[in-house]
Amino acid sequence: AGVFELQIHSFGPGPGPGAPRSPCSARLPCRLFFRVCLKPGLSEEAAESPCALGAALSARGPVYTEQPGAPAPDLPLPDGLLQVPFRDAWPGTFSFIIETWREELGDQIGGPAWSLLARVAGRRRLAAGGPWARDIQRAGAWELRFSYRARCEPPAVGTACTRLCRPRSAPSRCGPGLRPCAPLEDECEAPLVCRAGCSPEHGFCEQPGECRCLEGWTGPLCTVPVSTSSCLSPRGPSSATTGCLVPGPGPCDGNPCANGGSCSETPRSFECTCPRGFYGLRCEVSGVTCADGPCFNGGLCVGGADPDSAYICHCPPGFQGSNCEKRVDRCSLQPCRNGGLCLDLGHALRCRCRAGFAGPRCEHDLDDCAGRACANGGTCVEGGGAHRCSCALGFGGRDCRERADPCAARPCAHGGRCYAHFSGLVCACAPGYMGARCEFPVHPDGASALPAAPPGLRPGDPQRYL
């Protein structure tokens, strides 16, 4: 028995162009949580198949709201480890699925809404009792960084957690070839004699006479550190003072894995975890065929015409992905307009519209000019979710129903008197002034400050500006 532990370090945009927008917004704050599913062996099963080794759900992360206009940062994470207890032996090789979920905290019908943001999967070899292994996985434009380890629960010990500890027979020390059962120092491993000289700290054995090394150690007695030992970030040259490794360029930089493979660092190099349908050191070889049953969720497998596409999965309605492994979220089609909230109900799409909008896709502005009449020859002008009437001369108000007093604003300058007229207004100018609004002084010499006269008129001729 033991526990598989997963520590999420970061979840955010991956490198390269096309960074994703934050999954949360001011309108729709949200928080993340994670789910891990473990299966024994290297079989890559459907995401929906049972998590035979166990599964765990993280706590919810802090509530996050996108800063307007900002690219998606690394998103705030839940505290603590995800722990998956296993009852029997640790299998040594296992498959994992880690899902990043978004909990939307907006005004939801029936409580919060959950949606799957990203899913990564891989297959790994891992000895129980070893140090934390680091990994980076990509899912679309997102990148997940995490560490994991398997540890045995006392009294089990060993790489598979199959050896048990026994109470000490002598009060002071364990018998020859046996080690204390840390952390139960008052117990000893059941008798199993490793190769003479096998490092008690860095070596172990599952058969008498052998000496197997924990990750980061090598040599016949596990006494020689490999070049990337003991540091969480196994990169770069050794620091002279600490003996720990300083981060430097790593073997996974630039992702050497082709065809969507994900890279994980190993003590000496890197290892590619290939998606279904590919294998080889860098996932460069395509090999899965329909005989391998690669299509999930009832997808129909059709053999490809060439090695480049050894098979194609024709997905049933509601599923997508190269292996029909993803449930179609039709909301990803972005069907709702004007900030409407999309709900994929399975049988139909629904858009929940913001106030002021309506229609199956929130495409109708309820305050627009449709069905609105502006009276007395006024014209309707749309804008910003509201409408207004631009009224004909002599009318005012929201719908141009109010007769306006054109003289109310005292439009005649220099003491001119205003008269309401069917065509607008007329200004009777005081002596010495002229113009439609009495704005031009008449000069004593007979010339005026009028603009250039229209053809056929000389400055100073009587004119009526209306």
Epitope: P23, G140, P335
Partner: antibody
């Protein structure tokens, strides 16, 4: 006004890769998903799939899984279609189109891709 | 996948004619039926969406109707600029599918 402007025609050899761009203007790019449609010479229109411009998540029609990849450069309001390991049957005009919730309401002018040895 | 069938692959009509192009879906598509026009130069434009709604900027001589599995596009007064190929498309279920097209020519 709303416009989708695609990159120019391409002449490629079998086995090569082509990347077509579709630059959007006149609207908020991340509010509408972008779709790709193929038209082989003398044939009809065939929907290839879409990409969510907010999350970058693509969705592919069955016939376009594997060698085809949709991507975005959101800061440039640009969507891309990449076709790897080109084959003769990829010879076609490829259109990008914006989806408004009911239909593909605005289309690019199309990019002709010719694959010939 | 939903099959979309345009039984008439080409038709000839005279200027001023009333022209109807039909389209049939292999199952009920709940009015999620759109019509597109592709001009001889290759440009594609949306004409009608959701069976009968006219896209902005499209002349009112174009109209659409139908329900369930049977839909049609009507051009009430054929003009020279309407010479094009017309495609129907269902948007009810993924994958979206197009009809084979109807090429409209002038007599």
């Amino acid at each position: 006004q709303i416009q989708l402007v695609q990159s120019g025609p391409e002449l490629k050899k079998p086995g090569e890769t082509v990347k077509i761009s579709c630059k959007a203007s006149g609207y908020t790019f991340t509010d509408y998903s972008m779709h790709w449609v193929k038209q082989a010479p003398g044939k009809g229109l065939k929907w290839m799939g879409w990409i969510n411009t907010e999350t970058g998540e693509p969705g592919y029609a069955d016939d376009f899984k594997g060698r085809f990849a949709f991507s975005l450069e959101t800061s440039a309001s640009t969507a891309y279609l990449q076709i790897n390991n080109l084959k003769n049957e990829d010879t076609a005009t490829y259109f990008c189109a914006r989806y408004d919730g009911y239909a593909m309401d605005y289309w690019g002018q199309g990019t002709s891709v010719t694959v010939s040895s | 996948d939903i099959q979309m069938t345009q039984t008439t692959s080409s038709l000839s009509a005279s200027l001023g004619d009333r022209v109807t192009i039909s389209c049939r879906a292999s199952q009920d598509i709940s009015n999620y039926l759109n019509w597109y026009q592709q001009k001889p130069d290759g440009t594609v434009k949306l004409l009608i969406y959701y069976t009968s709604r006219l896209h902005s900027g499209v002349p009112s001589r174009f109209s659409g109707s139908g329900s369930g599995t049977d839909y049609s596009l009507t051009i009430s007064n054929l003009e020279l600029e309407d010479i094009a190929t017309y495609f129907c498309q269902q948007g009810d279920m993924l994958p979206w599918t197009f009809g084979g097209g109807t090429k409209l020519e002038i007599k």
